[in-house]
Structures are given as structure tokens and as C-alpha cells.
Interface confidence: low
């Protein structure tokens, strides 16, 4: 049979509510969306958590719940709740976790959170709260976790915040707060997560976030500031920092001097236009900094002390010059991007040994020289389009092993340098009208994208069956040598027959196809025929 | 490159509960927010919930409010949903998803595979 | 209940561009920038495509794009291509219910 209190546990369950055993002999009451209007009477002393969410109960009379002195968790989320009277959470001694979001509540029900001293997590966001008044929080000694979001909150209720020096996670974001006066967390000393995100936050106090000394996530995003937030500097623990999508321009010299822990910092969508060069120092577990369209940077930043940045973007800036200690600071680089600069020297990359993809297009970068990319064993893509790079040292690319897609386009080239290039996977090479010559298949077995200045220099690529077709026009009279096209066929432009240039030319497509099938562009067509083909030697 | 991996299909009988969990790649896992979101055969996606792991807190879909419980063992950068009092209509495929941003109003930039959970007596 | 209003289908020729719009309320759409795109092709995860209303994830091609208007969101595919075909999905947050909702899904049929 079962013991009296289990029967007592069967007998407490409200009509149409749901109930079940906890394991510790209490019992779980589920009573939501059922239309209630006001608060079940038959319940188990024994209960330890009940749900009357989404219902309609629009009022709480004093004392509606008496002797639930194990209750832990009650949630009274989406009802209709405008005002909570002074004692309607009398006696609930155990309560840990009470939710009140999704009312309608128009300030925080002072009295009726007195003396709920197991308190550790109350959520009151989505509701019309405007006013907090000073004492509200003053008996919730161990609270934890408060929400205040998506309320209409003005400012930041500093008073009532005082006692709460067990919170360690809050959010006040979605309010409409225009202003974080000083020493407004002053007692937070335990706060680990603070978020002011979606407020009208356009002014900071110097000091408005001393006594956080817990705290290690700030989340300032989509506000009005218009001044970088100097005030973090007092958050030595802090790791992560959002300040995206706000009116900031500039980021100051020593930015993050005092935040040594950093591991994320968002401040993208903002209009950066200036940053100190000693910003982002001595940052050690920062993994990624990016900075877009910052015009004012013409130095590159010092990294001292950042060295575990793994991915480095800084665009849109006019830095000129690379310093040559580049990679001293960054040894884990494994991502760089310096697109849309004005650099035109490059200093020597190969102490960055992990780095995996480099963009430097749309700079002034007129030559590549031997050291610059020497030994980057892990390096797969590497980005110098749009510059004006005339000279390639023939050993620029020999010692890239891992290198698959390399990018040239709109430069100056009128030779391209092929050692070491064998293991490419995409070569871009288009719009450099000084680049006449032909590329060998044979140099790039394992090619599966080409772009050619030209559309005859496609034909070594098996791309001409219909343009062989359609133009067959094959300079008639050209006495060039064929030695160079193809070893096997060598000669046989000899025959003047025309069935036996057709042969041959199927014969050459077939070969071709047999290495591997490359997309090749501008593909020959009777616009851009293969007629030149013979013009030029093929790169061996 | 962060990488979400959920458990394997489930078949339950009505009244039972299953616990799908999602496993992330990658050394931000308490820095962001996992959700949940669930697609029944031929419908739309439906949002359950999230969870913020350095915290434990979990926001849920009203719709789901008691029925449904979200937590995170930062230990092992895997999140879990658990759904009780399963019925046939909640026969879907249920993905898990990281909050590209952190918090609960932002886009979900990475999701799980896909987890099928048949509810059939 | 879907909170999001978008069209059952639309179809367009390879080449064409194509809108689809995604309405929703004051509370929602209307309110913050937190809208956000997804295309989902049969049996995959959903991709996201567009996020806080117009800005492009990388990787994401160009001929997609974001825009909002009042309560209405919408999303712009240009020189449609034959992967486009997809399903595309809005997604918002609610202000008022603290809730994060999608609309129902738009069929996109490449012709």
C-alpha cells in the first residue's frame, strides 16, 4: 500500500492540473494554460514547484498560498497580473526560483518580495515596470539571477540594487536607459553577466562600473554611445565585450588596458574611423580582431602582448607599411586580412608559421619577393589581387606545400612564376593584359578552377571542343612549332589535311581530358577563338 | 570552424519524455546562447527555447513552458533538451543552434544536423 | 500560431529577382532590428542568409539581401539561380511576449 503521505500527495492535485512526484517525495503541479482565473485552492502542502503560466488570473489576494513552506519554484508567467499585494508570498520559505515575466506589472511589488530569503532567481521582464522603488530588493539576500528586460525602465535603479551583493547575472537590456551613472553597480560584487543591450544608453559615468569585480560579460550593443565605454577599465576579469551597433568613432590608445582576461570584444557596426595603435595591447587570450573601414589607421596596431590572435582583419584602413616584426607579435596567426590598404612593401611572413590564409588585394603592392612567403607550411589561400605586382621571384611560391588557391588577378604580371605551385586547386590570374604567354596542364595536375587574361590560354585546358568547331580557323599559314603544345603529337600540325587536323585536335582533347577536367575562363567561342593559340610558348 | 552534433533519432510512446543532446566544437561554448527549434513533417520551424551556459539561464517558448527543459554542462560543451509529456504531434525533427551574438534575439548562425523524434504508440 | 506572415510560394525564372515579405506586428518586426533569414533545402539544416535585418553572414552571396519597412521585412534574391530553390524562412523577436518566432516559410520555385 502506499504510505498516508503519498495519498496526501494524490489528494493535492488540482482539477485538470497535471501532477507528479519530484523523487524527494514532493510533488510537481502543473496548472498551466487551463484558463484559470484565479489560483487553485486544493494544493499539497508537498508541493515543491508549481506552474500556473499563461492563465488569467489578474489578481493575487494576501496569503493565496498558505503553508506551501516547501514550494521552490513558482511560476506565475503571461497572466494579468498588475499589482502583487504585500503578503501573497508569505510563508514560502523555500522559494528559490519565482517568474513573474509576461505580466503587466508596472513596478517591481516591494512588499511582496520581503523576506524571501531563498530566493535565487526572479524574472519580472516583459512587463510595464517604469519604477523600482529603492528597498524592493532589501530582503533577497540570495539572489542570483534577476531579469528586468523589455520593461520601461529610464535609468538604472542604483538604490535598489544595493543589497544584492549575491547577483551574479542581470539584465536590464530592452528598456529605454540613456544614462549609466557612476557607481551605478557599486555592490555588484559578485555580478558575472550584465546586460544593457537595445537601451538608449548615450553616456557612461567615468566610474560607472566600479565594484564589478566578478564581472565577465558586458553586452552593450545597440545603443546611442557615441564615446568608446572608458569605463570598462576597472573590469579586470571581464571576457567578453559588445559594443556593436552603436555611434562610436574612435577606439583610444590603451583601449583595453584594464581587461587582460578578454576573449571576445563585438564592436562592429559602429562608424571607427580612428584607432590608438597600443589599442588592442597585451590582450593574451584575444583569438579574433576585426576592423573594418577604420580610414584614419595608416599604422599598423601594436600587438605586443596579443600573441594568441588567431585572426587578424584590418580593412579599409590606409596602412602603407608592414612593420617587419609583424609576425613576432602574432605567431598563432592563422587568418590575416589587409584587403583595401595602401601597403606596398611586404616584410617576411614566414615566422608565421600557422598562418592559413592570407587577403591582401586591392593594396599598392608592386613586387613579391623571395623570403616574403617563405616556408608557410599550412598556408592554403593567398589573396594579391588588384595591386601592382610586376615582379614575382621565380622561388616567390616554392615552398608552399599546402597552397590550393592563389589569386593574381589585376596585377602588372607579364611572367608567372610555376614552382611549387603543382598541388593549386583554383588560379586566378585574369586581367593581367601584359600576361601573353600559355600555362601548361601538366604544372597544375590537381586544377579544378583557372582564370586566364586571355581565352585562347584556356585551350590547354581542354576547354576548346566547341570553339575548335565553331572557329577552326587555326592561322593557316602560321609555321610556328608544335614541339611545345603537346610531346606526343609533336609534328603533326604538319598535315595539311583538314581531316587530320581533326583527328589530331580530338586526339589533344581526349589527352587533356584524361589528366583531369578543368573550368577554364574566358572560354574560347567564336568570339574569343583559339586562334592565337600558336602566338605564345606554353610555360613548362 | 564551430560544429554543432546532436544525438541520433528517437523513437518514444505517448506520456514518455526524450532528451536530445547537442554537442559543440569549438572553445566558445559558454560565450553563446544555444536554442532549440523543432520542424514537424512538411511545417515550418518553431522556436522552444535557449539557454545561456555560463549561466544556466534558460528561456523558454510559452508554448513549451513545463514541458520542455534546456541546460548546458559547460564540462563538456553540450546542451541538452528534454521534452516530457510527449505526444504524437510532437513527432518532428528538433535542431539545436548557436546564437550568432550571444543573446537570445539574435540569429542563429550555426545549427546541429538534426535530431528525428517519432512519438507513436 | 505563427506570428509572421510570409507567402505560401513564390516562383521566378533563372535570371529574375524575387521578394518575399515577411509581416509581422509592432511588437516584432516593427520594433527591433532582430530580423533574421534562413533558407532550408529538403532533409538539411537551415542556413542563415541574412541577419539583423540586412547584414550578409560571409560566405553568403551577394544576390541576397535584407530590407525592412514598418512591420513588413522583407528579403530580395537577385539573379535567381537554379540552387536558390528552397524554402526561406523569417524569423523575429517578440518584444511583448519575449518569445522568438518565425514566420510560416515561403516555397521558392526556380522555373
Known amino acids: 500500500g502506499s504510505s498516508p503521505r503519498s495519498g496526501v500527495l494524490l489528494r493535492g492535485c488540482p482539477t485538470h492540473c497535471h501532477c507528479e512526484p519530484d523523487g524527494r517525495m514532493l510533488l510537481r503541479v502543473d496548472c498551466s494554460d487551463l484558463g484559470l482565473s484565479e489560483l487553485p485552492s486544493n494544493l499539497s502542502v508537498f508541493t515543491s514547484y508549481l506552474d500556473l503560466s499563461m492563465n488569467n488570473i489578474s489578481q493575487l489576494l494576501p496569503n493565496p498560498l498558505p503553508s506551501l513552506r516547501f514550494l521552490e519554484e513558482l511560476r506565475l508567467a503571461g497572466n494579468a497580473l498588475t499589482y502583487i499585494p504585500k503578503g501573497a508570498f508569505t510563508g514560502l520559505y523555500s522559494l528559490k526560483v519565482l517568474m513573474l515575466q509576461n505580466n503587466q506589472l508596472r513596478h517591481v511589488p516591494t512588499e511582496a518580495l520581503q523576506n524571501l530569503r531563498s530566493l535565487q532567481s526572479l524574472r519580472l521582464d516583459a512587463n510595464h515596470i517604469s519604477y523600482v522603488p529603492p528597498s524592493c530588493f532589501s530582503g533577497l539576500h540570495s539572489l542570483r539571477h534577476l531579469w528586468l528586460d523589455d520593461n520601461a525602465l529610464t535609468e538604472i535603479p542604483v538604490q535598489a540594487f544595493r543589497s544584492l551583493s549575491a547577483l551574479q547575472a542581470m539584465t536590464l537590456a530592452l528598456n529605454k536607459i540613456h544614462h549609466i551613472p557612476d557607481y551605478a553597480f557599486g555592490n555588484l560584487s559578485s555580478l558575472v553577466v550584465l546586460h544593457l543591450h537595445n537601451n538608449r544608453i548615450h553616456s557612461l559615468g567615468k566610474k560607472c562600473f566600479d565594484g564589478l569585480h566578478s564581472l565577465e560579460t558586458l553586452d552593450l550593443n545597440y545603443n546611442n554611445l557615441d564615446e568608446f565605454p572608458t569605463a570598462i577599465r576597472t573590469l579586470s576579469n571581464l571576457k567578453e565585450l559588445g559594443f556593436h551597433s552603436n555611434n562610436i568613432r574612435s577606439i583610444p590608445e590603451k583601449a583595453f588596458v584594464g581587461n587582460p582576461s578578454l576573449i571576445t570584444i563585438h564592436f562592429y557596426d559602429n562608424p571607427i574611423q580612428f584607432v590608438g595603435r597600443s589599442a588592442f595591447q597585451h590582450l593574451p587570450e584575444l583569438r579574433t580582431l576585426t576592423l573594418n573601414g577604420a580610414s584614419q589607421i595608416t599604422e599598423f596596431p601594436d600587438l605586443t602582448g596579443t600573441a594568441n590572435l588567431e585572426s587578424l582583419t584590418l580593412t579599409g584602413a590606409q596602412i602603407s607599411s608592414l612593420p617587419q616584426t609583424v609576425c613576432n607579435q602574432l605567431p598563432n596567426l592563422q587568418v590575416l586580412d589587409l584587403s583595401y590598404n595602401l601597403l606596398e612593401d611586404l616584410p617576411s611572413f614566414s615566422v608565421c608559421q600557422k598562418l592559413q590564409k592570407i587577403d591582401l588585394r586591392h593594396n599598392e603592392i608592386y613586387e613579391i619577393k623571395v623570403d616574403t612567403f617563405q616556408q608557410l607550411l599550412s598556408l592554403r589561400s593567398l589573396n594579391l589581387a588588384w595591386n601592382k605586382i610586376a615582379i614575382i621571384h621565380p622561388n616567390a611560391f616554392s615552398t608552399l606545400p599546402s597552397l590550393i588557391k592563389l589569386d593574381l588577378s589585376s596585377n602588372l604580371l607579364s611572367s608567372f612564376p610555376i614552382t611549387g605551385l603543382h598541388g593549386l586547386t583554383h588560379l586566378k590570374l585574369t586581367g593581367n593584359h601584359a600576361l601573353q604567354s600559355l600555362i601548361s596542364s601538366e604544372n597544375f595536375p590537381e586544377l579544378k578552377v583557372i582564370e586566364m587574361p586571355y581565352a585562347y590560354q584556356c585551350c590547354a585546358f581542354g576547354v576548346c571542343e566547341n570553339a575548335y568547331k565553331i572557329s577552326n580557323q587555326w592561322n593557316k599559314g602560321d609555321n610556328s612549332s608544335m614541339d611545345d603544345l603537346h610531346k606526343k603529337d609533336a609534328g603533326m600540325f604538319q598535315a595539311q589535311d583538314e581531316r587530320d587536323l581533326e583527328d589530331f585536335l580530338l586526339d589533344f582533347e581526349e589527352d587533356l581530358k584524361a589528366l583531369h577536367s578543368v573550368q577554364c575562363s574566358p572560354s574560347p567561342g567564336p568570339f574569343k577563338p583559339c586562334e592565337h593559340l600558336l602566338d605564345g610558348w606554353l610555360i613548362r | 570552424q564551430v560544429q554543432l552534433v546532436q544525438s541520433g533519432a528517437e523513437v518514444k510512446k505517448p506520456g514518455s519524455s526524450v532528451k536530445v543532446s547537442c554537442k559543440a566544437s569549438?572553445?566558445?561554448?559558454?560565450?553563446?546562447?544555444i536554442g532549440w527549434v523543432r520542424q514537424a513533417p512538411g511545417q515550418g520551424l518553431e522556436w522552444m527555447g535557449g539557454i545561456r551556459p555560463n549561466f544556466g539561464w534558460a528561456k523558454y517558448a510559452q508554448k513549451f513552458q513545463g514541458r520542455v527543459t534546456i541546460t548546458a554542462d559547460e564540462s563538456t560543451s553540450t546542451a541538452y533538451m528534454e521534452l516530457s509529456s510527449l505526444r504524437s504531434e510532437d513527432t518532428a525533427v528538433y535542431y539545436c543552434?548557436?546564437?550568432?551574438?550571444?543573446?537570445?534575439?539574435?540569429?542563429?548562425?550555426?545549427w546541429g544536423q538534426g535530431t528525428l523524434v517519432t512519438v507513436s504508440s | 500560431d505563427i506570428a509572421l506572415t510570409q507567402p505560401a510560394s513564390v516562383s521566378g525564372s533563372p535570371g529574375q529577382s524575387i521578394t518575399i515579405s515577411c509581416t509581422g506586428t509592432n511588437s516584432d518586426v516593427g520594433t527591433y532590428n532582430y530580423v533574421h533569414w534562413y533558407q532550408q533545402h529538403p532533409g538539411k539544416a537551415p542556413k542563415l542568409m541574412i541577419y539583423d535585418g540586412s547584414n550578409r553572414p560571409s560566405g553568403v552571396s551577394n544576390r541576397f539581401s535584407g530590407s525592412k519597412s514598418g512591420n513588413t521585412a522583407s528579403l530580395t534574391i537577385s539573379g535567381l539561380q537554379a540552387e536558390d530553390e528552397a524554402d526561406y524562412y523569417c524569423?523575429?523577436?517578440?518584444?511583448?511576449?519575449?518569445?522568438?518566432?518565425f514566420g510560416g516559410g515561403t516555397k521558392l520555385t526556380v522555373l
Open positions: 543552434a548557436r546564437y550568432g551574438q550571444g543573446h537570445f534575439p539574435s540569429a542563429f548562425d550555426y
Open positions: 524569423q523575429a523577436y517578440d518584444s511583448h511576449s519575449f518569445n522568438i518566432v
Open positions: 569549438g572553445r566558445t561554448f559558454s560565450n553563446y546562447a
